[in-house]
């Protein structure tokens, strides 16, 4: 399913192919080659068309080299050099730079805020349902059910910290054992990786950008899925996480610590709390089978309340029903007893938009979901645009070299581990792996960070989010301290185990290969990205959930054949690529299967037909709407007026030839011009900081 390779700087031409390249897979990025490219900003790039095989002269002049779509784009500078500017120009350029930085920080701020509101929106739409998932009694005996509940709940509330805190409170109140909680934590780890995958979808407009962004986001997904695939059976068989964490918890005499520092929330909360405020306790109460909570709204109305513990007198049928024999009396007509009650007096209302609307949670959630996705998308587009204009020439070279270059030999292997620490540290600062990985996604998309470097940063992010949980656990009250700490440690060691599995040996870095494969497919068939999201985060977990409810027999009856077929396909695929001669002629390729079972082309035709109606209405819509449309319908021609996702038409006609990415043009500005996004005159006024 990998795209056809093409010449380094060739103009896309669907009629001319590179001989003998058909079977080649994209090669790994060559760092030295990339450095040369970026350093040589002055050198003109020769544009050649693929000539017939008899024309050898050009081939000698310009050696044919396969262009890897995963190579980082050269973000060249189109502006006037700093040294060539007059004082006025330099001042103007300086203020332009400052302005861009302020804009970038502003959009980044609203990007993070919209992620927070997106989480709130998801909780309003699906929070109560998520809480009800937890109240299923089968979780105790079925780890697979626990896993999918963890995935579904985290996807529904868009926050692994919310789902883990529900688990903690359930363990604290003995509704759940630590053993039963571990698969839920694993599921929560998977569920939290949906956020940056959604963010990656926003970069659908540009195929090559989308390829990188989507792969960069899904590397997190694949790491989590693969870790669970290996570690869940290991945990079920050995209970190693439970045992290790229990030993740690019992060997230390922990005292209650302080709350984990809210570093990023301090900045974002003043804004997000003006939009909506939620009463997170409601979801926990539903999870703990509190009937009253089912009718409560998640939207917080009263922010200042006075809680008074008092004794109230209540009537009882007879004095035998008294709560305490000494606190019992009659007034001659009714029998009374004293009952301790907590009386909550509402003092001040919250200050947010929805406080006086009294709308149902679903309505508020839907409004916020749409708005936050629009803001998220808008901010992302602007961040990518600003970064695209800032990260050019020497700036790009410096940044890319700093981020993507390894330490000198023999310490090159340490670079990745440093990246893991950086990822953990950054996540600890922003207090959310979703925020960190979501911020990373556009940077991967525009080519500032390679997937190979993004991978350890993401793994570090997974560790960072667990250290936050450990701190939060240490700050929890006495009764919840042990359970919350043990669960936080389980989460921590699960991620450590995952890193040990899928990082130290380069050969085992399967998530990178899988993410790149998915990136290639999604770049070619963009609807597949949405399909992947629905399948992996909703349909598979919901199917397993449904089968688990039907009982072990049904789950095994359906699951075993499915697993058997998957293993069979994987083994066959391995043999086809490594030693096809072992296999009979018929099994050496997939041609024996009908086309719809081995290719996405027929499916693409179905999707295109199905979304045909959107293509017509897509024209002249706003940029954000157009992006969403392009994601569904792969339409390059329909969005002419807003030009937000128009690709080169030749590429669409010759399906197997990959779409030319902006990196094949002299610079990013020209590539944008070609796609009608930037007026031609803009390129002359661009300035570079260095």
């Amino acid at each position: 399913m990998a795209p056809w390779p093409e010449l380094g700087d060739a103009q896309p031409n669907p009629d001319k192919y590179l001989e003998g390249a058909a079977g080649q897979q994209p090669t790994a990025p060559d760092k030295s080659k990339e450095t040369n490219k970026t350093d040589n900003t002055e050198a003109p790039v020769t544009k050649i068309e693929l000539l017939p095989s008899y024309s050898t002269a050009t081939l000698i002049d310009e050696p044919t080299e396969v262009d890897d779509p995963w190579n980082l784009p050269t973000l060249q500078d189109s502006g006037i050099k700093w040294s060539e500017r007059d004082t006025k120009g330099k001042i103007l350029c300086f203020f332009q730079g400052i302005g861009r930085l302020i804009l970038l920080l502003g959009f980044l701020y609203f990007f993070v805020c919209s992620l927070d509101i997106l989480s709130s929106a998801f909780q309003l739409v699906g929070g109560k349902m998520a809480g009800q998932f937890f109240s299923n009694s089968s979780i105790m005996s079925n780890p697979l059910l626990g896993l999918v509940i963890g995935v579904l709940v985290t996807v529904l509330v868009q926050s692994s910290s919310t789902s883990t805190s529900i688990v903690v409170s359930m363990v604290s109140s003995s509704l759940l054992t630590v053993r039963a909680a571990i698969p839920i934590i694993m599921g929560a780890n998977i569920g939290t990786s949906i956020t940056n995958t959604i963010v990656a979808l926003m970069q659908v407009g540009d195929r090559s950008e989308f390829r990188r962004a989507f792969a960069g986001a899904t590397v997190h997904d694949f790491f989590n899925w693969l870790s669970v695939l290996v570690l869940l059976p290991v945990e079920v068989a050995t209970h190693y996480l439970e045992i290790i964490t229990q030993l740690i918890v019992e060997s230390f005499h922990f005292k209650n610590g302080e709350d984990a520092p809210d570093l990023l929330k301090v900045i974002t909360k003043p804004f997000t709390k003006l939009i909506v405020q939620l009463d997170k306790k409601v979801i926990s109460q539903i999870a703990m089978n509190d009937e009253k909570a089912k009718n409560k709204s998640l939207v917080k109305i009263w922010c200042k309340t006075f809680t008074n513990k008092t004794q109230i007198n209540v009537t009882v049928p007879s004095t035998a029903n008294c709560t305490s024999p000494s606190l019992c009396w009659t007034d001659g007509i009714q029998n009374w007893t004293m009952k301790n009650v907590t009386y909550k007096e509402n003092i001040a209302k919250c200050q947010h938009i929805f406080v006086n609307f009294h709308l149902p949670d679903l309505a508020v959630g839907t409004i916020l979901l749409i708005l936050s996705l629009l803001v998220l998308c808008g901010c992302l587009i602007m961040i990518v645009k600003i970064l695209g204009s800032v990260l050019k020439g020497q700036v790009a070279t410096v940044i890319k070299k700093t981020i993507n270059t390894d330490f000198p030999f023999p310490f090159a292997w340490l670079t990745g581990y440093l990246a893991i620490l950086v990822g953990a540290g950054m996540t600890f600062i922003v207090q959310s792996s979703s925020v960190f990985t979501s911020a990373l996604t556009p940077l991967i998309g525009i080519g500032v960070i390679t997937i190979e470097r993004a991978y350890p940063l993401t793994l570090g992010s997974n560790i960072g989010t667990t250290t936050t949980a450990i701190l939060a656990a240490l700050a929890s009250p006495g009764n919840a301290l042990r359970s919350s700490l043990q669960i936080a440690l389980c989460h921590f060691f699960f991620n450590i185990s995952g890193i040990l599995l899928w990082y130290p040996i380069p050969f085992t870095r399967l998530p990178i290969r899988m993410a790149k494969g998915l990136g290639n497919i999604s770049a070619k068939y963009r609807w597949f990205a949405v399909f992947y999201l629905i399948i992996f985060f909703f349909l598979i977990p919901l199917t397993v959930f449904g089968l688990s409810l039907a009982g072990w027999r049904v789950l095994v009856g359906v699951g075993v054949p499915v697993v058997f077929i998957i293993i069979l396909v994987l083994c066959l695929r391995l043999l086809q690529s490594r030693c096809p001669r072992v296999l009979p002629k018929k099994l050496q390729n997939w041609n024996f299967l009908p086309l719809w079972m081995r290719s996405l082309k027929p499916w693409d035709a179905v999707v295109s037909k199905f979304t045909g109606c959107f293509q017509m209405r897509c024209c002249c819509c706003c940029r954000v709407c157009c992006r969403a449309c392009c994601l569904l319908c792969d339409c390059p021609k329909c969005c002419r007026c807003s030009k937000c996702c128009e690709d080169l038409e030749e590429a669409q006609e010759g399906q197997d030839v990959p779409v030319k990415a902006p990196e094949t043009f002299d610079n990013i500005t020209i590539s944008r011009e070609a796609q009608g996004e930037v007026p031609a005159s803009d390129s002359k006024t661009e300035c570079t900081a260095l």
């Epitope: 009537t315 024999p325 000494s326 009396w329 009659t330 001659g332």
Partner: antibody, heavy 120, light 107 residues
Framework: QVQLVQSGAEVVKPGSSVKVSCKTS????????IHWVRQSPGQGLEWIGG????????NYKQNFRGRATLTADKSTSTAYMELSSLRSEDTAVYYC?????????????WGQGTTVTVSS | DIQMTQSPSSLSTSVGDRVTITCTAS??????VAWYQQKPGKSPKLLIY???TRHTGVPERFSGSGSGTDFTLTISSLQPEDVATYFC?????????FGGGTKVEIK
């Protein structure tokens, strides 16, 4: 101030009935229970029954059931006790007393008493 | 019905003396006991409720104690105005019942 003012003394014939009133003031009538207690000459106190004016729920001591009827008029904040089939042993001073509903403070205010003499 | 037995039925003592009146319930009544004072020719007046809580305006010399079945009303220093009959009452279960009364006189 809190006041429970009872009707004047009554002399009645055996077998007849008597209705004693208790007009209250100085407190929320519906927030209290009005009890009726009698004291026979040279004897102790005996509880007859009580009424919750708010909902007209009543309760009587077993030996007064069917003979005593307690009523309350919220509009005038007045409670009434009617005792029928009077016998000579019903000669006593009848008191009304208030008791704060849902509270354990007992009978904190009493009326001045109404003397009922059953005599042929 | 719960019987409340008061003792003594009468007592005569001097001004300034400590007076103790006891009341015994026929079964456990917790602390649901009240004490009333009735001066000659007057209606009863609440002194103590919930076994030991003084009602508003009652002088500090009056105190109540006890729980279960045995209860005590104590006048720490008898005053001339304390001459009256004292009744105990249980309100643990219906019907409400009173003790026979204790008549307090000054020698």
């Amino acid at each position: 101030q809190v006041q429970l003012v009872q009707s004047g003394a009554e002399v009645v014939k055996p077998g007849s009935s008597v209705k004693v009133s208790c007009k209250t003031s100085g407190f929320f009538f519906t927030e209290y229970i009005i009890h009726w207690v009698r004291q026979s000459p040279g004897q102790g106190l005996e509880w007859i029954g009580g009424i919750i004016p708010n909902n007209d729920v009543t309760n009587y001591k077993q030996n007064f059931r069917g003979r005593a009827t307690l009523t309350a008029d919220k509009s005038t904040s007045t409670a009434y006790m009617e005792l029928s089939s009077l016998r000579s042993e019903d000669t006593a001073v009848y008191y009304c007393a208030r008791w704060r509903n849902a509270y354990y403070s007992a009978m904190d205010s009493w009326g001045q008493g109404t003397t009922v003499t059953v005599s042929s | 019905d719960i019987q409340m037995t008061q003792s003594p039925s009468s007592l005569s003592t001097s001004v300034g003396d400590r007076v103790t009146i006891t009341c015994t319930a026929s079964q456990d009544v917790g602390t649901a006991v009240a004490w009333y004072q009735q001066k000659p020719g007057k209606s009863p007046k609440l002194l103590i409720y919930w076994a030991s809580t003084r009602h508003t305006g009652v002088p500090e010399r009056f105190s109540g104690s006890g729980s279960g079945t045995d209860f005590t009303l104590t006048i720490s220093s008898l005053q001339p105005e304390d001459v009256a009959t004292y009744f105990c009452q249980q309100y643990r279960t219906s019907p409400l019942t009173f003790g026979g009364g204790t008549k307090v006189e000054i020698k």
